[in-house]
């Protein structure tokens, strides 16, 4: 067992050119808080993953201001170390995320608003009970400065912790294969703590809280005898040949504990033993509970209420995230219909719609034609979120009020004259050609490309076009 | 101008199920979470469960067995149904909105008077 | 889950004169996550205070909210005649979501 500490000595601007505008204004106070989380392993993991080693929160740092027309300082920090203990052997290499957190203090709506202002992660090996070491990390145009190390909570004591030592009790020496702590020589190595109820007399461990069988011995807690001697596989398949009686696979084969967790069999199943910081069944919650206020921007915590369960944020309309730490662009949804224009006002989304549409989302079709009248007889069609008059002949323009020329289109063919005329046109067909609009040619031998003509209509009589 | 209108029988029989319905007008449905709160004559306001209109639904554990909130987006409504009623689900229930700054109240109903009796 | 006790039960004051209203939470509220809201006899509550300390809008500046943590104060600093009603407070730190039992503000 232990604590990894972290002190951050400094968050302001990194060298070099394109210095940031100070997160801080005289309109909007701020202060800075941060967040570390720490990963076993050289893991590459995402941001969201667990931090199966521990996350701490730091206090919030004092309230800013910003001088106007300086530069953005170094921030003012918050007082104190971020602390992660952990309950277990301390892996030697570990990843980390630090994230700086602004709390902005202005008149907002709902309370203070948080957003994430910058996130380093980085990967390191570090031995407990080493000094301290120093680290600088940039993000985007800010830096971090800042120191980490791990040490050991007594009694534990080593590069991974898991060393246990105690007060000598003789003045001279340590017990039988006992060995002097350094650098602690005034205690002694304590012998290693196997796991509860491990067989003192067919058992052993060689680290804290296993349990490894002597031969002939089997189950986790080395009390199950083996029929024969010559069962030296502990776990293997029961042999015909040899007659040996071994348990199958046993619930805590593969450790199904999460986050360094160790399992014990019970009588239906089996139990783990959790790491402090983490809960549930298989350790796999981590131990943030709704106490911490883990949820930002107006977000509820919900669950969470004791450690043993996990927390979920419900986060307001307009953020997202794990812990509602993030704005939605939530124009990018396309939620406006019928090619109505987004605006993503903060507290509300509004659509602004098209002619012809209407809704919180421009979702309903207006009628168009409703209070329009085509002039003289046309009929109104809808389309498109705008209305169109289908006019009666001899008329035209957007509601049939003008009177048309119907023959300004030049509608009969092959040189035939046109006339109006009060119900439509008459195409007067130049000679060889018939048809409403002269289109058809009349054939030398009397025959047109036509049915036989209506009696008392002769080729090249005018045709009307009705 | 958003308001809110409940609607719904007033008298329950004890072990029925009670079922109101929430209009919603001046507001999307689809841009707030919408609430259910009660009110028993005389007493104090007892938060009864929250939906999202992506289904996203959160109830009081003292009520969480018994009660279902709906969402429909088309009717701009939602709706609350509480089974196996009992003299003391007896209250005025109301329909709130959910602020987009937190989980409190900015608009209600005028609220609807439940009794349940046989 | 936050129990929040309200104090004191009754408040009997003249117009004109100061109310101080009490909400002590079982456990901290984080971010000031606290609302109250003023109810009349036969209509729905209504919100006056959001984030501990901001208004509503519409809601006179008579009207002012304080606090933190675990204890917090909503402060009418002249009684109006249509001030005297049942005051709730309300978190919305983490779920359950919970009310205070009132305090009614009733004319002497």
């Known amino acids: 067992a232990g604590v990894f500490e972290l002190q951050i000595h400094s968050f302001g601007p990194g060298p070099g050119p394109g210095a940031p505008r100070s997160p801080c204004s005289a309109r909007l106070p701020c202060r800075l808080f941060f967040r570390v989380c720490l990963k076993p392993g050289l893991s590459e993991e995402a941001a969201e993953s667990p931090c199966a080693l521990g996350a701490a929160l730091s206090a919030r740092g004092p309230v800013y201001t910003e001088q106007p027309g300086a530069p953005a300082p170094d921030l003012p920090l918050p007082d104190g170390l971020l602390q992660v203990p952990f309950r277990d052997a301390w892996p030697g290499t570990f990843s980390f995320i630090i994230e700086t957190w602004r709390e902005e203090l202005g008149d907002q709506i709902g309370g203070p608003a948080w957003s994430l202002l910058a996130r380093v992660a980085g990967r390191r090996r570090l031995a407990a009970g080493g000094p301290w070491a120093r680290d600088i990390q940039r993000a985007g145009a800010w830096e971090l400065r800042f120191s980490y190390r791990a040490r050991c909570e007594p009694p534990a004591v080593g590069t991974a912790c898991t060393r246990l030592c105690r007060p000598r009790s003789a003045p001279s020496r340590c017990g039988p294969g006992l060995r002097p702590c350094a650098p602690l020589e005034d205690e002694c190595e304590a012998p290693l703590v196997c796991r509860a109820g491990c067989s003192p007399e067919h058992g052993f461990c060689e680290q804290p809280g296993e349990c490894r069988c002597l031969e002939g011995w089997t189950g986790p807690l080395c009390t199950v005898p083996v029929s024969t001697s010559s069962c030296l596989s502990p776990r293997g398949p029961s042999s015909a040949t040899t007659g040996c009686l071994v348990p199958g696979p046993g619930p805590c084969d593969g450790n199904p504990c999460a986050n360094g967790g160790s399992c014990s069999e019970t009588p239906r199943s089996f139990e783990c033993t959790c790491p402090r910081g983490f809960y549930g069944l298989r350790c796999e919650v981590s131990g943030v509970t709704c106490a911490d206020g883990p949820c930002f921007n107006g977000g509820l915590c919900v669950g969470g209420a004791d450690p043993d369960s996990a927390y979920i944020c419900h986060c307001p309309p307009g953020f997202q995230g794990s812990n509602c730490e993030k704005r939605v662009d939530r124009c990018s949804l396309q939620p406006c219909r019928n090619g109505g224009l987004c605006l993503d006002l903060g507290h509300a989304l509004r659509c602004r719609c098209r002619a012809g549409f209407a809704g919180p989302r421009c979702e309903h079709d207006l009628d168009d034609c409703a209070g329009r009248a085509c002039a003289n007889g046309g009929t109104c069609v809808e389309g498109g979120g705008a209305h169109r008059c289908s006019c009666a002949l001899g008329f035209g323009g957007r509601d049939c009020r003008e009177r048309a020329d119907p023959c300004a289109a030049r509608p009969c063919a092959h040189g035939g004259r046109c006339y109006a005329h009060f119900s439509g046109l008459v195409c007067a067909c130049a000679p060889g050609y018939m048809g409403a609009r002269c289109e058809f040619p009349v054939h030398p031998d009397g025959a047109s490309a036509l049915p036989a003509a209506p009696p008392g209509l002769r080729p090249g009589d005018p045709q009307r076009y009705l | 101008q958003v308001q809110l209108q409940e609607s719904g029988p007033g008298l329950v029989k004890p072990s029925e199920t009670l079922s109101l319905t929430c209009t919603v007008s001046?507001?999307?449905?689809?841009?707030?979470?919408w609430s259910w709160i009660r009110q028993p004559p005389g007493k104090g306001l007892e938060w009864i469960g929250y939906?999202?209109?992506?289904?996203?639904?959160n109830y009081n554990p003292s009520l969480k067995s018994r009660v279902t909130i709906s969402v429909d987006t088309s009717k701009n409504q939602f709706s609350l149904k509480l089974s196996s009623v009992t003299a003391a689900d007896t209250a005025v229930y109301y329909c709130?909105?959910?602020?987009?700054?937190?989980?409190?109240?900015?608009?209600w109903g005028q609220g609807t008077l439940v009794t349940v009796s046989s | 889950e936050i129990v929040l006790t309200q104090s004191p039960g009754t408040l009997s004051l003249s117009p004109g004169e100061r109310a101080t209203l009490s909400c002590r939470a079982s456990?901290?509220?984080?971010?000031?996550?606290l609302a109250w809201y003023q109810q009349k006899p036969g209509q729905a509550p209504r919100l006056l205070i959001y984030?501990?300390?901001s208004r509503a809008t519409g809601i006179p500046d008579r009207f002012s909210g304080s606090g933190s943590g675990t204890d917090f104060t909503l402060t009418i600093s002249r009684l109006e005649p249509e001030d005297f009603a049942v005051y709730y407070c309300?978190?919305?730190?983490?779920?359950?979501?919970?009310f205070g039992g009132g305090t009614k503000v009733e004319i002497k």
């Open positions: 939906i999202y209109y992506s289904g996203t639904t």
């Open positions: 309300q978190q919305y730190d983490r779920s359950p979501l919970t």
């Open positions: 456990q901290s509220v984080n971010k000031n996550y």
């Open positions: 001046g507001a999307s449905i689809s841009s707030f979470y």
């Open positions: 709130a909105r959910i602020a987009v700054a937190g989980f409190f109240f900015d608009y």
């Open positions: 984030g501990a300390s």
